[in-house]
Interface confidence: medium
Amino acid sequence: RWRGEGTSAHLRDIFLGRCAEYRALLSPEQRNKNCTAIWEAFKVALDKDPCSVLPSDYDLFINLSRHSIPRDKSLFWENSHLLVNSFADNTRRFMPLSDVLYGRVADFLSWCRQKNDSGLDYQSCPTSEDCENNPVDSFWKRASIQYSKDSSGVIHVMLNGSEPTGAYPIKGFFADYEIPNLQKEKITRIEIWVMHEIGGPNVESCGEGSMKVLEKRLKDMGFQYSCINDYRPVKLLQCVDHSTHPDCALKSAAAATQRKA
């Protein structure tokens, strides 16, 4: 058995359903996506040995499914997947990788072929600990590269300052596949949001620990850089589920307004 979870049940149906649903979000000139063709291109990786899938095996899939990302709407992240999805609000606020077509169809899913058979493996799939060239990691590497290349304007990044190992994973998708593929000439600045879990530990904030590494790296690449601790719009969303926590107390001016009302 592999270390990762097996192929998601009803993978094809979920994929095609998400694809069809997403088409409605695209502008009319980009809506002519053929979901069946996109699935067939994706399925190429499902016909290969589960430790022999390269990022390039998804090239056709990416070419068929890619579309433009609105300027200033890109949102990169590490260790904050659910919060990013909630805040992005189905492309309304931002368009993270999970809100572009090629990311949406695979978000939170797992897939691989059986090791010595042509069928899908529903029991387990390899992770990077099992082998580097596994179907899921290779997919997200290729998708991450494309997402970076297509991003422009103000780049937003949400990181988790409560993560025990640090807000910026020095080895991670953002560090290894996204930062190197940012197109400097298309980008005006990079804005980082270091979010802390409500009631959680403050492991790192802007300018601390691994965040220093990220700041140095981006500045040395020639990017304009800014960092915000607990970006208020995201904090307010976190507070929806923790309304009575002290971290979510309204500022006195707002409270006074409430009392007058």
Epitope: G207, G209, S210, V213, K216, K219, D220, G222
Partner: antibody
Amino acid sequence: EVHLVESGGGLVQPGRSLKLSCAASGFTFSNYDMAWIRQAPAKGLEWVASISIRGGSTYYRDSVKGRFTVSRDNAKSTLYLQMDSLRSEDTATYYCVRGTDYYYDYFDYWGQGVMVTVSS
Amino acid sequence: NIQMTQSPSLLSASVGDRVTLSCKAGRNINSYLAWYQQMLGEAPKLLIYNANSLQTGIPSRFSGSGSGTDYTLTISSLQPEDVATYFCQQYNSWTNTFGAGTKLELK
């Protein structure tokens, strides 16, 4: 063997300028962050400024911001500290130091130090 | 700025003693802490980094420990050549800060 040799110190009047240099040898200079640390006579150590490997990031302690400028010439393996509007409280031995690697800011090699005296 | 407080400021000990120096940070510094030794008239020398990692070439009688806000430098058996001032430094934030130092002398 790693060597860091500071120069350019001396006696200067308040309000005047001085430029310190640090010649590095024995390692690939462009692979390391560098910094300046000072020590007032019979006092503790005080970080002054840091610069990242390609010079894209520079950082200063609040008391020298706007007066001091750290820079580097990777081709010459030299670190600089331009000190303007000097004050008496800037009197100290200034050490050129090497950051250990790209990720952290502890300092594994130090120069012998150069004395800067600000006095009228 | 993160305040670093060292104690004691002066410590007298005998050769062979086990010596413990303390450094307290004003907030959690996530073990981003280094210890330096400065002999009289010389530049400081790195002993310990990341709270407990021994720098290459430093004798094994030196060790570091601690986490969060509280850190310790221990000399397991004091030698005459260890007479010096010891400084701790946090590098968790951009504004690296040093403690005021502990002067170690022989009794």
